[in-house]
């Protein structure tokens, strides 16, 4: 028997520095977690103790904090190189800055293979990107070889900016021939490493003949055997065992997100490459694990540029950006409009001639808007200003909801109106009229939504049985502020870009902004 230790991360999302327990900015260092300096310590410890160790990343290193905003992926290459990763799969967010923003900072600089079998380049890009990412890689490990085959969510064109010269194929269809190829090369230990979410990970384990282990990402799935060490609730045991169609037991793993845990899986193979046993657990990277001093010093060196960036002007406003709770928790506020407009702008993807865009709607809890921005400071808007407006380090995500769920959400928005509560919704691509004289749960008297399947966008009444795409904060997608109906009834949820980054990019693009209060939210006569 031959034993392999797989260490794995996924959906790190730019958390190079240690974070608080909820993966936001570290405040009390003695209780902070994760970060590359701490990860390095644990990885080195395991490498010293065990012979056959692979360190793998299942994608979405890009996007999530000011680190990515400023360094644009160079930080990912540098610190992953320092940790001596053995392979990485491409995630959807690796395309957030377009193909060039992947090629230059990461693909050309990584000292480890970057993989995806179901992304095929065409046209002029094919020669430019040739060899920079691979469908699979055979890695020598000790006296054996292990095949790693990569995959990426085929939804990436709707979630990011891969452009028109990359085709995202069905994962299972694309993986099978690559695994077959590895078999013909006498590689009998094969790991599928990828970024399509836990459901697809399980399907790959079930359907792709020859895959021995699946290491996944995208869905931020936390798996654990025994008593979990922090706040995350396990979605199943670690590893999650799937019985393949050809009768094999295939371990499937994922390690939550944000570098909070290091996945740790031990696999025992027989001489024919069959998995005999698999066991392990994610390791919580808490403060009991010291941060490596060399990496920490380097992080501090790289940090200097971030501090300078946060005070630079992104753009100007010529109007007061009303982000006060007195406005945003009671009525349409122009800060809410600005943020929603930025959220939609960030999700412009012309992927189908029938649609002007795949999504037109935005909802945003008023309680998530934490500060106004005064235009009388020469109109200057900085990252620092935006961090005061959006201090929680969330993301703006894409969900699919039925019209009936949206109607419930808008009823919830005003079910206890007048108490300055955070659930009052700011909107984009939506016209809502409330009648507060009616009883809670029956106050939405008009709800019109902007069409997507149209050449000239216009507002149509919401249809209860239709499925709509909506951009919203991850906080709402997870049921925050009492929006349990969104969490319970959403049909799909894909995590998006860092909230501040979305707004800052929009402001930089527009240069001068002047958002108005324009009748997106109305109250029917006599009730307000």
């Amino acid at each position: 028997a031959w034993e392999l230790t797989i260490l794995h991360t996924n959906d790190v999302h730019s958390r190079l520095e240690q974070t608080s327990e909820d993966s936001s900015k570290c405040v009390n260092a003695s209780r902070c977690m994760g970060g590359v300096a701490r990860l390095f310590t644990k990885v080195q410890q395991i490498r010293r103790a065990e012979p056959n160790v692979l360190l793998l990343d299942a994608g979405d290193q890009y996007q999530g904090t000011i680190w990515f905003t400023v360094y644009k992926g160079a930080e990912v290459a540098h610190f992953m190189n320092a940790l001596r990763y053995d392979a990485m799969a491409l995630g959807n967010h690796e395309f957030d800055n377009g193909v060039e923003g992947l090629i230059e900072p990461l693909l050309k600089e990584a000292k480890f293979p970057i993989l995806s079998a179901n992304i095929k380049a065409k046209g002029p890009l094919a020669s430019q990107i040739s060899g920079l990412y691979l469908p699979y890689k055979v890695l020598p490990v000790g006296d054996e070889v292990v095949g790693i085959v990569g995959y990426t969510s085929k939804e990436t064109p709707f979630l990011s900016n891969p452009g028109t010269n990359l085709v995202f194929e069905d994962e299972i269809t694309a993986l099978q021939p690559e695994v077959d190829k590895l078999k013909t090369l006498n590689v009998n230990k094969i790991i599928a490493l990828g970024h399509s979410g836990f459901e697809m990970d399980k399907l790959i384990a079930q359907k792709v003949r020859g895959v021995d282990v699946v290491v996944g990402g995208h869905s931020n799935t936390f798996l654990y055997t025994g008593n979990p060490p922090s706040k995350e609730v396990p979605a199943g045991k670690y590893p999650f065992i799937v019985t393949s169609d050809d009768g094999r037991k295939v371990p499937v793993v994922q390690a939550y997100a944000f570098g909070k845990y290091l996945g740790y899986l031990k696999i025992e193979f027989d001489e024919r490459g069959n998995v005999i046993s698999s066991h392990g657990n994610p390791i919580l990277l808490n403060s009991s694990i010291p941060e490596d001093p060399s990496i920490k010093a380097d992080i501090n060196k790289w940090r200097i540029k971030l501090d300078n960036y946060s005070t630079q002007e992104l753009g100007k406003t010529i109007v007061y950006l009303d982000g006060s709770s007195q406005s945003c928790r009671f009525r349409e506020c122009n800060m809410g409009n600005l943020i929603c407009d930025a959220m939609i702008n960030n999700n412009l993807r012309h992927t189908d001639e029938m649609f002007w865009n795949h999504v037109s709607m935005c909802i945003l809890n008023g309680g998530g808007i934490r500060s106004p921005i005064d235009e009388r400071n020469n109109g200057t808007i900085t990252w620092e200003n935006l961090a005061a407006v959006l201090p929680f380090g969330g993301t703006f995500d894409l969900v699919q909801l039925k019209g009936s769920t949206l109607k419930k959400a808008f009823e919830h928005s005003v079910h206890r109106y007048g108490q300055s509560t955070g659930e009052f919704l700011q909107v984009g691509g939506i016209h809502v009229v409330y009648d507060l004289s009616r009883k809670p749960g029956d106050r939405v008297v008009k709800l019109d939504v902007l069409c997507t399947k149209c050449r000239v966008p216009s507002y149509d009444p919401l249809k209860m049985d239709e499925v709509y795409k909506v951009i919203l904060p991850n906080f709402l997608a997870n049921g925050g502020d009492g929006f349990q109906m969104i969490k319970d009834e959403l049909l799909r949820h894909d995590s998006g870009d860092q909230d501040i980054n979305v707004v800052s990019t929009y402001i930089s693009k527009m240069k001068v902004i002047y958002p108005a209060v324009e009748g997106r939210i109305k109250f029917s006569t006599g009730s307000h």
């Epitope: 080195q44 490498r47 010293r48 012979p51 056959n52 160790v53 692979l54 160079a74 540098h78 190189n81 320092a82 001596r84 053995d86 050309k108 600089e109 000292k111 890695l139 020598p140 490990v141 000790g142 006296d143 060399s294 990496i295 380097d298």
Partner: antibody, heavy 119, light 108 residues
Framework: QVQLVQSGAEVKKPGASVKMSCKAS????????MHWVKQSHGKSLEWIGY????????TYNPKFEGRATLTVDTSASTAYMELRSLRSEDTAVYYC????????????WGQGTTVTVSS | DIVMTQSPSSLSASVGDRVTITCTAS???????LHWYQQKPGSSPKLWIY???NLASGVPGRFSGSGSGTDYTLTISSLQPEDFATYYC?????????FGAGTKLEIK
């Protein structure tokens, strides 16, 4: 102190193979990558490739891929390079070199192994 | 591959002279991954300057390094007898790792 001690000079015939060693001491062997560099007489330095001692993962300069093989024995803190199908232009000094993990500079060099290929 | 071109290939100078050696990369290199080595006859190369401008341990302060993008320099403010050697620049910004052809510093 940190040092790399390489095996002695070798004289080989064209077509033969040579395997040289590099014994590391003064640091944790698995913590740093080990590179190999060729220097022909009076010439510049040419990178052959490197190995990650903790799992024997290798990366080669395409020019040497297929002809050079890097291995390690972690229990002996020793790295090896085998060069096959030797030809006269392989006559050179070969250095094993430790690299920094952050900026990948070569901070510790072996004393070199001289290989002479001659019929 | 990134080609590193050093100039001059050799240089005769006197003790006390100020000397500058340049290294030009065929495409842009991050200054963090540009390093210099000193080699004397019969010895292994020694790390001399790392990440463009940081002197390795034991390297005298008369040495300095600078540059960005494709152009890098090593400067000796006042040449001393022990500085006569060959200097190599090196990049590992992108694979494969490459060296310059070297600049041989000789006594005039």
């Amino acid at each position: 102190q940190v040092q790399l001690v390489q095996s002695g000079a070798e004289v080989k015939k064209p077509g033969a193979s040579v395997k040289m060693s590099c014994k590391a001491s003064g640091y944790t062997f698995t913590d740093y990558n080990m590179h190999w560099v060729k220097q022909s007489h009076g010439k510049s330095l040419e990178w052959i490739g490197y190995i990650k001692p903790h799992n024997a993962g290798t990366t080669y300069n395409p020019k040497f891929e297929g002809r050079a093989t890097l291995t390690v024995d972690t229990s002996a803190s020793t790295a090896y390079m085998e060069l096959r199908s030797l030809r006269s232009e392989d006559t050179a000094v070969y250095y094993c070199v430790r690299s920094d993990f952050l900026y990948w500079y070569f901070d510790v060099w072996g004393q070199g192994t001289t290989v002479t290929v001659s019929s | 591959d990134i080609v590193m071109t050093q100039s001059p290939s050799s240089l005769s100078a006197s003790v006390g002279d100020r000397v500058t050696i340049t290294c030009t990369a065929s495409s842009s290199v991050s200054s963090s991954y540009l390093h210099w080595y000193q080699q004397k006859p019969g010895s292994s190369p020694k790390l001399w300057i790392y990440s463009t401008s940081n002197l390795a341990s034991g390297v005298p302060g008369r040495f300095s390094g600078s540059g960005s993008g494709t152009d890098y320099t090593l400067t000796i403010s006042s040449l001393q007898p022990e500085d006569f050697a060959t200097y190599y620049c090196h990049q590992y910004h992108r694979s494969p790792l490459t060296f310059g052809a070297g600049t041989k510093l000789e006594i005039k």
